[in-house]
Amino acid sequence: QKSSIEKCSVDIQQSRNKTTERPGLLNCPIYWQQLREKCLLFSHTVNPWNNSLADCSTKESSLLLIRDKDELIHTQNLIRDKAILFWIGLNFSLSEKNWKWINGSFLNSNDLEIRGDAKENSCISISQTSVYSEYCSTEIRWICQKELTPVRNKVYPDS
């Protein structure tokens, strides 16, 4: 099985003299699971929320962002263990007194039905069936994501 880098280089060889439009990430890397236009990676250890956030960035990814209820359900369908909780990229902003995604946007109150309090040092976890507010210091697993996003790629002929 070719890696996405190998696949990319084959494409480049085949279209040397063209300007092409091609996804930055053609396929999910090995060990990642594809869910629509995202690649997900589930941790096999536990961490507080901030360590989880940092660990995802070592994989050139971010903690999971969930757009809507539909995406939540599809993500939960990938969780095989009933009682396991996973951090996602949503925590409580004390200054704005609201749930804030790590990309800076705020939670649309209709998107997730959160069990627990919205208060300082609270972060959001998901399980197979629910969404919970937990102390950010709680040590649980986490989910990283990479987006499959198209980028313009200019390929120049050999000089």
Epitope: I30, H44, T45, V46, N47, D81, E139
Partner: antibody, heavy 120, light 107 residues
Amino acid sequence: QVQLVQSGAEVKKPGASVKVSCKASGYTFTGYTMNWVRQAPGQGLEWMGLINPSSGGTYYNQKFKDRVTMTRDTSISTAYMELSRLRSDDTAVYYCARLGDNYRGYFDYWGQGTTVTVSS
Amino acid sequence: DIQLTQSPSFLSASVGDRVTITCKASQDVGTAVVWYQQKPGKAPKLLIDWASIRHTGVPSRFSGSGSGTEFTLTISSLQPEDFATYYCQQYSTYLYTFGGGTKLEIK
């Protein structure tokens, strides 16, 4: 080179507790999660749980949840596994094993094993 | 819990033989399967991860394949040092489980 060196054999009476240590060297101790796996005489392998040495976070196999405690001392790069209320069927070789990757469940390095015998 | 059933439990073979060990899972585990080798009185040694990826330093005569519920470990040409017990393990769920082992003996 990576090495996990465990404490010596123990003989315990039923109802007692045992604490096994696992000293890591040759890598950054806080960079890899430590697991504990046991093997009863002539039997297969049974996963007991894990500890993240960086944060101290633990996750235990439900079977052992009420009896096992995993701790670590980062200053001496050592992980510990304590099993309480010992029974005769806890007689086994106990191994510490390093999780090879935060995102996959394989064990790339193992300790030499500690034999725990539970007998009255 | 996901059960892993290894077959055969015992296998007699000669140096130079090609041997195959099977591991069957009670549920789909994707490719989250590991193979270990264990010699008497020693700790297990990692051979293969993700069903088919050889660990650093593992000889090329060891290969793994399979996905879903059926997995195989093949040793293409047995060497004297390969006589040992082999275990499969799954990590598709967070309750990691192991197969019962296959003891490979000299014929």
